[in-house]
Interface confidence: low
């Protein structure tokens, strides 16, 4: 089976991704997230499906989920705003904005990430960084420290082939290659970063990880700029 991190990746440099968030349910990692403003974290709407009766919080400034780190802080969530068109049985509009109980204390290890506002596809083959605390192998092992992997963007036509995602990839979604290197369970809601800019959010639909015929699917944030702005306003 694929070895290493995320799937086929490696441990991230500690605190080198200060925008990275862990969305937590009852104190345990549930999904990834990305700090997009001082008081707002962007994640995936489906992550809340698991959280019906639990307490959702956001961990910022973390590398290790378990070890004490000076920059780590757990924030309560004041408001959860899933995209109004997100539905349990589709991957479309799979975005969630979480308003923290207070503005995050910013510093070297906690800083919002600029997000793409120009609604244009990332060029196929572009190497993008995806990070998360999701499972790192097919036996389901979860890491304690943040993992990352570089993935080439895959063109939509290939991703929509019958053998791949069979037409499910709309203009508001994008794909990245998944041949043994991939995002997986627990990475949902995390950022796909291309050239230092947030381009995509890991979708949380059911998908086998690490299989080249089932590329990773990411929600294109530029396609939702108006909605994000309206919520953050």
């Amino acid at each position: 089976p694929p070895r290493g991190r995320i799937l086929g990746g490696r441990e991230a440099e500690a605190h080198a991704r200060p925008y990275m968030a862990s969305v937590q349910l009852n104190g345990a990692h549930l999904c990834g997230g990305v700090l997009v403003a001082e008081q707002w974290v962007l994640s995936a709407a489906h992550c809340l499906e698991d959280a019906a009766d639990g307490k959702v919080q956001v961990l910022l400034g973390a590398h290790s989920l378990s070890q004490p780190e000076p920059s780590k802080r757990l924030y309560d969530v004041l408001r959860a705003v899933p995209h109004p068109d997100s539905q349990p049985d589709t991957i479309d509009h799979d975005l969630l904005l979480l308003q923290l109980s207070e503005k995050a204390t910013l510093g070297p290890a906690v800083r919002p990430l600029p997000w793409q506002r120009v609604d244009r596809d990332v060029a196929p083959g572009t190497l993008c960084d995806v990070a998360g605390w999701g499972i790192v192998n097919h036996a389901g092992r979860r890491p304690d420290s943040l993992q990352h992997v570089l993935l080439p963007v895959l063109d939509r036509a290939t991703c929509n082939r019958r053998t791949h995602h069979d037409g499910a990839i709309t203009e508001r979604l994008m794909c990245a290659e998944s041949n043994r290197r991939d995002s997986c369970k627990g990475d949902s809601g995390g950022p796909l970063v291309c050239g230092g800019v947030l381009e995509g959010v890991v979708t949380s639909g059911s998908r086998v990880c690490g299989n080249r015929k089932k590329p990773g699917i990411y929600t294109r944030v530029a396609s939702y700029a108006a909605w994000i702005d309206s919520v953050l306003a």
Epitope: N26, A139, G140, S206, V208, K213
Partner: antibody, heavy 116, light 109 residues
Framework: EVQLQQSGAELVRPGALVKLSCKAS????????MHWVKQRPEQGLEWIGW????????IYDPRFQGKATITADTSSNTAYLQLSSLTSEDTAVYYC?????????WGQGTLVTVSA | DIVMTQSQKFMSTSVGDRVSVTCKAS??????VAWYQQKPGQSPKALIY???YRYSGVPDRFTGSGSGTDFTLTISNVQSEDLAEYFC???????????FGGGTKLEIK
């Protein structure tokens, strides 16, 4: 080395309950899903359910809802299967296993015999 | 519920032959299929996950293929130690529910 050591064979009366254990070594069960699988004599495999020991979350096959209860004790690195209201239909070997996209490691099995 | 059907309960083959064990899902399961080998008196052993990925240590004469509803485990150059029952298994990616096929017993002539 990864190992799943299951408790010994059980002979139980109809209507009683039994609790089987599966002690893991070589890994921390908090990092994996732990499953239980039933195999009746000369028959196939039936998945009972799984537990995520880190948070106690469980999922069961609907056929075993109310019959089986899966728990885990992370301090002893052990998963448990409790079976209630036993009947002859529950006579089987019960396996614990570990995994997500496939069950990579299995215990040696525990034979439960229900007999008056 | 998804049903996994292994229509051949028994298959007979000879050492050195190539044999294919088949499994049919009642609905599309993508590539969410694993294969197991169970020798008499032993626990099952995992061979294949995600339809075609071999577990480490599994001989490369075991090959998995298929997607959607039809899946095949092929054993090329069958050895006497391959005498066993073979089970397919499907799993939903969420919330990770599992179903086994009824099994196919491989007999060596």
């Amino acid at each position: 080395e990864v190992q799943l050591q299951q408790s010994g064979a059980e002979l139980v009366r109809p209507g009683a309950l039994v609790k089987l254990s599966c002690k893991a070594s070589g890994f921390n069960i908090k990092d994996y899903y732990m499953h239980w699988v039933k195999q009746r004599p000369e028959q196939g495999l039936e998945w009972i359910g799984w537990i995520d020991p880190e948070n106690g979350h469980t999922i069961y096959d609907p056929r075993f809802q109310g019959k089986a209860t899966i728990t885990a004790d992370t301090s002893s690195n052990t998963a448990y299967l409790q079976l209630s209201s036993l009947t002859s239909e529950d006579t089987a070997v019960y396996y614990c296993s570990r995994g997500l996209l496939g069950f990579a490691y299995w215990g040696q099995g525990t034979l439960v015999t229900v007999s008056a | 519920d998804i049903v996994m059907t292994q229509s051949q309960k028994f298959m007979s083959t000879s050492v050195g032959d190539r044999v294919s064990v088949t499994c049919k899902a009642s609905q599309n399961v993508g590539t969410n299929v694993a294969w197991y080998q169970q020798k008499p008196g032993q626990s099952p052993k995992a061979l294949i996950y995600t339809a075609s990925y071999r577990y480490s240590g599994v001989p490369d004469r075991f090959t998995g293929s298929g997607s959607g509803t039809d899946f095949t485990l092929t054993i090329s150059n069958v050895q006497s130690e391959d005498l066993a029952e073979y089970f397919c298994q499907q799993y939903n990616s969420y919330p990770h529910m599992y179903t086994f096929g009824g099994g196919t017993k491989l007999e060596i002539k």
